[in-house]
């Protein structure tokens, strides 16, 4: 077996070795989102391009129905960037009596769904107040970190407002993961 | 060959194994940019430190003339941060009739050049409107993702305005890539 | 030894191979910070959760007293996100005669301490002016890059103002590293 190296008169066993080229990997890129219903109090999930242009999945890492499917347990580096764009005419539009104004905001969450768990797990969140006076605005939120995942886990990217996502270029909004 | 493990009486062949320590890797750090002419409608490319301080290239990953040269086909994680700084006294300087003001902006692009392709490929873009009233401002844009690259590909970092790049510290503005 | 593969009549020596699963790795998550004294002119270091929830350390990568301890020399990818939150009523509060207003700012630094060096080394810095008029604000700073580290090096995350760090969720503020 890989990881067993044989000498003429004895055998030594090591942790399994594997070729880097056969590890599960994916880089997904933005597509225009179709408005869809989503659960109240849950941010909508983005769907992605997985084959065209810069996008790919390989080595049993599959994409289906907004989810990346984890084919093998291990430690994965997971990342996403979402570029938002919008128009805000005032920072202090939402006045709330007795406390400071609640700012507009943009949020990205990378979420793990495990079928045996009732609740999704938020792995990464990037959240930012938006206060741009009198002009169009645009800005990215980038996230990336390492997590221990189990075979069968599913990953998705949720955003606070799907209508603000910049879907115009594959290099602006993307999502990926690879086994370390 | 690496990846072939020998037993006394037979040979088993596996996908190629390789030591992690001999994979192509680079981390480049900022140096002051000298003003140079660049093509109209193309963002200027940054040049980098590749040897001093925190910067290094190893295992045939070479840096030359603003480009990282990819020595071996495979999946690479590529990243960059550019810290920008500037002075802006108004967000809405550029008024355009009939639509909201066009904001000032800062943009970073990681670009791949393949000699057999006539056009460079934009791998990653971070772009942000800048609206800072009445003070000097500074902020980073961070990018990172995984891409399948071919031997001979070249990578560079382009910015919207080279005169706004903070070149004062190697930890503020950097560019790197490593074979997974 | 791993990396030495034996045939019946001769021995071939290769660069050492090792299983990916036994490489030093850590992902640390935010906990509420207790106010502590720190050296003047040095940003305070954050302390972290290393076992509960999404946090883990493995394969001799240990966390102690705000530091990640590097157990083995090699190239590491190091990352952190810190989410800040605060309240700013004016961008130009700090007026300074004879020059533009000094903006408020938020800064994250990933620092390496080597016992044989008198001074810590700043590996990564994310620094941003904050100018949010008349509202609460919140925003993340993300950093990540690859560095060559030595056994015994220690890593920490320093911030400009510990009281502005959002410690409310493990997905908002985190710190990690893994051997490549």
């Amino acid at each position: 077996l890989k990881g067993q190296e044989f000498a003429p008169s004895h055998q030594q066993v090591y942790a399994p070795l594997r070729a880097d080229g056969d590890k599960p990997r994916a880089h997904l890129t933005v597509v225009r989102q179709t408005p869809t219903q989503h659960f109240k109090n849950q941010f909508p999930a983005l769907h992605w391009e997985h084959e065209l242009g810069l996008a790919f999945t390989k080595n049993r890492m599959n994409y289906t129905n907004k989810f990346l499917l984890i084919p093998e347990s291990g430690d994965y580096f997971i990342y996403s960037q979402v570029t938002f764009r919008g128009m805000t005419s005032e920072c202090s539009e939402i006045r709330q009596a007795g406390r400071p104004n609640k700012p507009d905001s943009i949020t990205v969450v990378i979420t793990k769904v495990t079928d045996s768990y009732p609740e999704p797990t938020q792995l990464l969140m990037g959240t930012k107040s938006v206060c741009e006076v009198g002009s169009n605005w645009f800005q990215p939120i980038y996230l990336g970190a390492m997590f221990s995942l189990q075979e069968g886990d599913k990953l998705m990217v949720n955003v606070s407002d799907i209508s603000l996502v910049d879907y115009t270029a594959e290099d602006k909004t993307f999502f990926g993961a690879f086994l370390l | 060959l690496k990846g072939q493990e020998f037993a006394p009486s037979h040979q088993q062949v596996y996908a190629p194994l390789r030591a992690d320590g001999d994979k192509p890797r680079a981390h480049l750090t900022v140096v002051r940019q000298t003003p140079t002419q660049h093509f109209k409608n193309q963002f200027p490319a940054l040049h980098w430190e590749h040897e001093l301080g925190l910067a290094f290239t190893k295992n045939r990953m070479n840096y030359t003339n603003k480009f990282l040269l990819i020595p071996e086909s495979g999946d690479y994680f590529i990243y960059s941060q550019v810290t920008f700084r500037g002075m802006t006294s108004e967000c809405s300087e550029i008024r355009q009739a009939g639509r909201p003001n066009k904001p000032d902006s800062i943009t970073v692009v990681i670009t791949k050049v393949t000699d057999s392709y006539p056009e460079p490929t934009q791998l990653l873009m971070g772009t942000k409107s800048v609206c800072e009233v009445g003070s000097n401002w500074f902020q980073p844009i961070y990018l990172g993702a995984m891409f399948s690259l071919q031997e001979g590909d070249k990578l560079m970092v382009n910015v919207s305005d080279i005169s706004l790049v903070d070149y004062t510290a190697e930890d503020k503005t950097f560019f790197g890539a490593f074979l997974l | 030894l791993k990396g030495q593969e034996f045939a019946p009549s001769h021995q071939q020596v290769y660069a050492p191979l090792r299983a990916d699963g036994d490489k030093p790795r850590a992902h640390l998550t935010v906990v509420r910070q207790t106010p502590t004294q720190h050296f003047k002119n040095q940003f305070p270091a954050l302390h972290w959760e290393h076992e509960l929830g999404l946090a883990f350390t493995k394969n001799r990568m240990n966390y102690t007293n705000k530091f990640l301890l590097i157990p083995e020399s090699g190239d590491y990818f190091i990352y952190s996100q810190v989410t800040f939150r605060g309240m700013t009523s004016e961008c130009s509060e700090i007026r300074q005669a004879g020059r533009p207003n000094k903006p408020d700012s938020i800064t994250v630094v990933i620092t390496k301490v080597t016992d044989s060096y008198p001074e810590p080394t700043q590996l990564l810095m994310g620094t941003k002016s904050v100018c949010e008029v008349g509202s609460n604000w919140f925003q993340p700073i993300y950093l990540g890059a690859m560095f060559s580290l030595q056994e015994g090096d220690k890593l920490m995350v320093n911030v400009s103002d510990i009281s502005l760090v959002d410690y409310t969720a493990e997905d908002k503020t985190f710190f990690g590293a893994f051997l490549l």
Partner: antibody, heavy 117, light 107 residues
């Protein structure tokens, strides 16, 4: 408050070396490049060169063979030396902060140096 | 070296009038152009950078425009303190160079 203050002799003999110092206060010295610019009486501005806290310099090629800009970070000051001066080097010499890059957003008040025997 | 040519050499106007100053580069400098104001016996003061971005604290009656080789500084309504010499500076190529200046004087 950021202040830049040039100092040095106001009169230099032809063929000698002009030496000026600029003292900086009120700002982090290491965050910027620091420049020298000159202006002959009644004429326009000419960039001489600049330096950062690590001692990295950029010079105007027209003056490069005669110019040395140096820095003393312990004193928060930087200096200009211009060798083999002639009457054509008579000018007001300004030190300035370069921010964000290649733009001079804050200047000293200038010092007149006359080259004459 | 890139040469910058400013015109006119002198502009005679009254307070309240509009001033339009021109700067032409010998080759393209993109938008890497700055404008400075200098009064007698004083150091220059940065007004505009990036061809059109006002520096901190500069009144909005000052505006810059242009790209490539042709640039304009406009003072929409001259105030008494605006009478001075104005210089353009390019930073699109090394060495950095300045124009010869335009004097705005009271008519």
């Amino acid at each position: 408050e950021l202040q830049l203050q040039e100092s040095g002799p106001g009169l230099v003999k032809p063929s000698e070396t002009l030496s000026l110092t600029c003292a900086v206060s009120g700002v982090s010295f290491s965050d910027y490049h620091w420049a020298w610019i000159r202006q002959p009486p009644g004429k326009g501005l000419e960039w001489i060169g600049d330096i950062n806290h690590r001692g990295h310099t950029n010079y105007n090629p027209s003056l490069k063979s005669r110019v040395t800009v140096s820095i003393d970070t312990s004193k928060n000051q930087f200096s200009l030396k211009l060798s083999s001066v002639t009457a054509a080097d008579t000018a007001v010499y300004f030190c300035a902060r370069d921010f964000p890059n290649f733009i001079f957003d804050f200047w000293g008040q200038g010092t007149l140096v006359t080259v004459s025997s | 070296d890139i040469q910058l040519t400013q015109s006119p050499g002198t502009l005679s106007l009254s307070p309240g009038e509009r001033a339009t100053l021109s700067c032409r580069a010998s080759q393209s400098v993109s938008t890497y152009l700055a404008w400075y104001q200098q009064k007698p016996g004083q150091a220059p003061r940065l007004l505009i950078y990036g061809a059109s971005k006002r520096a901190t604290g500069i009144p909005d009656r000052f505006s810059g425009s242009g790209s490539g080789t042709d640039f304009t500084l406009t003072i929409s309504r001259l105030e008494p303190e605006d009478f001075a010499v104005y210089y353009c500076q390019q930073y699109g190529d090394s060495p950095l160079t300045f124009g010869q200046g335009t004097k705005v004087e009271i008519k």
